[in-house]
């Protein structure tokens, strides 16, 4: 995993806009890492991140992310009236200038540098779950969510009329 | 528009049993964790039950006063909560609100209108 | 459990004044970074509406004049200025744990 401590030094200055150009609510700094306790890695190889969810060793010191929370209008066409509510959604920093980015097209979670203001992709709708857990919905795309796959980070379709293995689209926060 | 319409209230024996139900429209119901939250005649609200989605093998949570006597379940073919109230007390009189919580699980945003429950000899 | 404590139970104020509500949680409420702390508004004869969630965001279709602030375990609710239609019997709620759990209620009436 690559050095992270740059993460501490920009988290108030650099985040300062959301879908509609207005500050986050608040931000907080995390390790990410599955129902399982697996930890969330990123690792810069041929000049580009790689996600990873790996059982770190005694002692490996944990990555750290940048969770920048915004307030958002539900955008289902349920109801025109508001009633569904505003939401919670979230961009994720693990290092300066990178963002997780959702690729619908290779249903794949992948890390890229991009300049303000972020691009939907890089936004996801937060799900508080039990257990202490958080699910994070792509805003580009209602129903999928980042998910484990393979060891790796990946887009998993969640269909309500489905069995699904919950574990796979569960995961904690932690300041430690 | 978003409705929830309780019915099942009325007047009870203690120790007796009672079934609510809770008919959700305007909104796809199997897509959101339900509640049920109840008052007592000029108290404050209590919160009493919650079933989640089936993705989260609809897992339900209950408050401790209520835990083993009532059971919360839903009926995503119907649109429908339903609250099964068992061995119940004098304590348990109250309006019982069905309730809806948000896109992303924070916080209570629909509520029904609630049907009185008394329980009393 | 989690015991919200409300103070005043009870508060009268000048229509236009300020109106503040205070919440206090036995233990912290806070969790990934947010507080779990929400703010409901209860009139008489009807259910509950939400004002405030996460301690600081206001619901939708919710007046400007409601605002929360707060982290931990004290939480405020402010009416910047009162309103006829505000009165109504004033509620915080944790959501962090289960169960959730509400205040007792806050009544704010036209002085």
């Known amino acids: 995993a690559f050095g992270i401590s740059g993460v501490q030094k920009y988290t108030r200055a650099l985040h300062d806009s959301s879908i509609t150009g207005i500050s986050p609510i608040t931000e907080y700094l995390a390790s990410l890492s599955t129902y399982n306790d697996q930890s969330i890695t990123f690792a810069l190889e041929d000049e580009s991140y790689e996600i990873y969810v790996e059982d770190l060793k005694k002692d490996e010191k944990k990555d750290k992310v940048l969770l920048s929370y915004y307030e958002s209008q539900h955008p289902s066409n349920e109801s025109g009236d508001g009633v569904d509510g505003k939401m919670l959604m979230v961009t994720l920093s693990p290092t300066k200038d990178f963002w997780l980015h959702a690729n619908n097209k290779e249903h794949s979670v992948e890390l890229h540098k991009c300049e303000k203001p972020l691009p939907d992709q890089a936004f996801f709708v937060l799900h508080n779950m039990h257990s202490n857990c958080v699910s994070f919905e792509c805003k580009t795309d209602p129903g999928v969510f980042i998910g484990v796959k393979d060891n790796h980070l990946a887009l998993i379709k969640v269909d309500s009329s489905e069995n699904l293995c919950t574990e796979n689209i569960l995961f904690k926060l932690s300041e430690t | 528009e978003v409705q929830l319409v309780e019915s099942g209230g009325g007047l009870v024996q203690p120790g007796g049993s009672l079934r609510l139900s809770c008919a959700a429209s305007?909104?796809?119901?199997?897509?959101?964790?339900m509640n049920w939250v109840r008052q007592a005649p000029g108290k404050g609200l209590e919160w009493m039950a919650e079933?989640?989605?089936?993705?989260?093998?609809?897992?339900?949570h209950y408050a401790e006063s209520v835990k083993g006597r009532f059971t919360i379940s839903r009926d995503n073919s119907k649109n429908t909560v339903y609250l099964q109230m068992n061995s119940l007390r004098a304590e348990d009189t109250a309006v019982y609100y069905c309730?809806?919580?948000?896109?992303?699980?924070?916080?209570?945003?629909?509520w029904g209108q609630g049907t009185l429950v008394t329980v009393s000899s | 459990d989690i015991v919200m404590t409300q103070s005043p139970d009870s508060l009268a104020v000048s229509l236009g004044e300020r109106a503040t509500i205070n919440c206090r949680a036995s233990?912290?409420?806070?969790?990934?970074?947010?507080?779990?702390l929400n703010w409901y508004q209860q009139k008489p004869g009807q259910p509950p509406k939400l004002l405030i969630f996460?301690?600081?965001s206001q619901g939708s279709g919710v007046p400007d004049r409601f605002s929360g602030s707060g982290s931990g375990t004290d939480f405020t609710l402010t009416i910047s200025s009162l309103q006829a239609e505000d009165v109504a019997v004033y509620y915080c709620?944790?959501?962090?744990?289960?169960?959730?759990?509400f205040g007792q209620g806050t009544k704010v009436e036209i002085k």
């Open positions: 309730a809806r919580r948000n896109y992303g699980n924070w916080y209570i945003n629909v």
């Open positions: 305007g909104f796809t119901f199997s897509n959101y964790w």
């Open positions: 079933i989640t989605l089936k993705f989260n093998d609809y897992s339900t």
């Open positions: 233990e912290s409420v806070d969790k990934f970074g947010m507080s779990f």
């Open positions: 996460v301690a600081s």
């Open positions: 709620q944790q959501s962090k744990d289960i169960p959730y759990t």
